[in-house]
């Protein structure tokens, strides 16, 4: 129960990609505002997005402090223009989010093929190591810095002239594959965290083909 005309937030949902993390909820406010709090299981609550009429709150700055922690958020509802007002139990109306562990649950963003270079019958394909908002020693860490060898890339490649696809895997950001001389190949990559049971795979990268700008050829 709560103050008249104030409704509790519902459908609290974490939206997170490469650790950029936003909490979303419903409903769109009518004569009410929201404040969000976040904490770790053992930590203190920290308030964010004070008295907002938005139905989302960017919590990235909090979760990147320790991406392996499990976080809980809650959304408080207050009557607009009377934010000191509380529910009948003497507390503001609020709703808890599901628990969220960034390291285990953040979605893997769509990867990008940074470059490919052919030398004879070998092609080296390099995946861009995307920067995250996770910091260590005042520098932003890359996805590889954060996940280490937990992060795998799968390369899909095929002759431009044929439909038969092949794959290769790496726990670095580089592939070295054999190709047939004189043939053009196309490439796409996918990020995977094998140890996960949810959000294991990214979407596939855009396809890049030999004979286009990103490539380089050397005999």
């Amino acid at each position: 129960s709560g103050t008249t005309n104030t409704v509790a937030a519902y459908n609290l949902t974490w939206k997170s990609t490469n650790f950029k993390t936003i909490l979303e909820w419903e409903p769109k406010p009518v004569n009410q505002v929201y404040t969000v709090q976040i904490s770790t299981k053992s930590g203190d609550w920290k308030s964010k997005c004070f008295y907002t009429t938005d139905t989302e709150c960017d919590l990235t700055d909090e979760i990147v402090k320790d991406v392996k922690q499990t976080y809980l958020a809650r959304v408080f509802s207050y009557p607009a223009g009377n934010v000191e007002s509380t529910g009948s139990a003497g507390e503001p109306l609020y709703e808890n989010s599901p628990e969220f562990t960034p390291y285990l649950e953040t979605n893997l963003g769509q990867p990008t093929i940074q470059s490919f270079e052919q030398v004879g019958t070998k092609v080296n394909v390099t995946v861009e190591d995307e920067r995250t908002l996770v910091r260590r020693n005042n520098t932003f860490l890359s996805l590889r810095d954060v996940f280490g060898k937990d992060l795998i890339y799968t390369l899909y490649y095929w002759k431009s002239s044929s439909s038969g696809k092949k794959t290769a895997k790496t726990n670095t950001n580089e592939f070295l594959i054999d190709v047939d001389k004189g043939e053009n190949y196309c490439f796409s990559v996918q990020a995977v965290i094998p140890s996960r049971t949810v959000n294991r795979k990214s979407t596939d990268s855009p396809v890049e083909c030999m004979g286009q700008e990103k490539g380089e050829f050397r005999e």
Partner: antibody, heavy 117, light 107 residues
């Protein structure tokens, strides 16, 4: 509990086609590729190919291109392998299995295919 | 395509023996290799993934080592239930070839 339940044994005539099913349960079907493997009588394991249930993209060993066609039905969490133009050489046990990128961790019980006139 | 050569093809040993099986690849696999056990009439069962990691529920007498092109699978002290056929599998690339298998029999 992760399970892959395959369809029962098949006895078919040469030249015919057959469709083997593999129903997955106990995990999110679209998160893991499904491998298919053949084992001929008294022989070793041969990799046929795999399908990514999320997008339907398939990969085949060259020896099975044109012989095997892999599909999925996401709504029923079921993978299928159709084998066509069957000959006695195709008589074998066919397995589906769940790919976890670093290995294949759960296997179906196998479907025995006998091709005989 | 990468080829896998597994040896020996068969092996006789006694309970309590230490047994070693090798798998050689024609190109480097880093550690993209798995080992399986198969008993007659049954599906294969994963024992080792990523060359050295023991799969869930697998006894510690099984181990894997190696990287690049040379891999070894070891059973430190054979138990009666270990008599079976063992396969290596490259998971680095497609086609995801299996070794020819090693049949482990009671001496």
């Amino acid at each position: 509990e992760v399970q892959l339940q395959q369809s029962g044994p098949e006895l078919v005539k040469p030249g015919a086609s057959v469709k083997v099913s593999c129903k997955a349960s106990g995990y999110t079907f679209t998160h893991f590729n499904v491998y298919w493997v053949r084992q001929s009588p008294g022989k070793g394991l041969e990799w046929i190919g795999y399908i990514d249930p999320d997008n339907g993209i398939t990969f085949y060993d060259e020896n099975f291109m044109g012989k095997a066609t892999l599909t999925v039905d996401k709504s029923s969490s079921t993978a299928y392998m159709q084998l066509n133009s069957l000959t006695s050489e195709d008589s074998a046990v066919y397995y589906c299995a769940r790919d976890v990128t670093t290995a294949v961790d759960f296997w179906g019980q196998g479907t025995t295919l006998t091709v005989s006139s | 395509d990468i080829q896998m050569t597994q040896s020996p093809s068969s092996l006789s040993a006694s309970v309590g023996d230490r047994v070693t099986i090798t798998c050689l690849a024609t190109q480097t696999l880093d550690t993209w290799l798995a080992w399986y056990q198969q008993k007659p009439g049954k599906a294969p069962q994963l024992l080792i993934y990523a060359a050295t990691y023991l799969a869930d529920g697998v006894p510690s007498r099984f181990s894997g080592s190696g990287s690049g092109t040379d891999f070894t699978f070891t059973i430190s002290s054979l138990q009666p239930e270990d008599f079976a056929t063992y396969y290596c599998q490259l998971v680095y690339s497609s086609p995801s070839t299996f070794g020819q298998g090693t049949k482990l029999e009671i001496k």
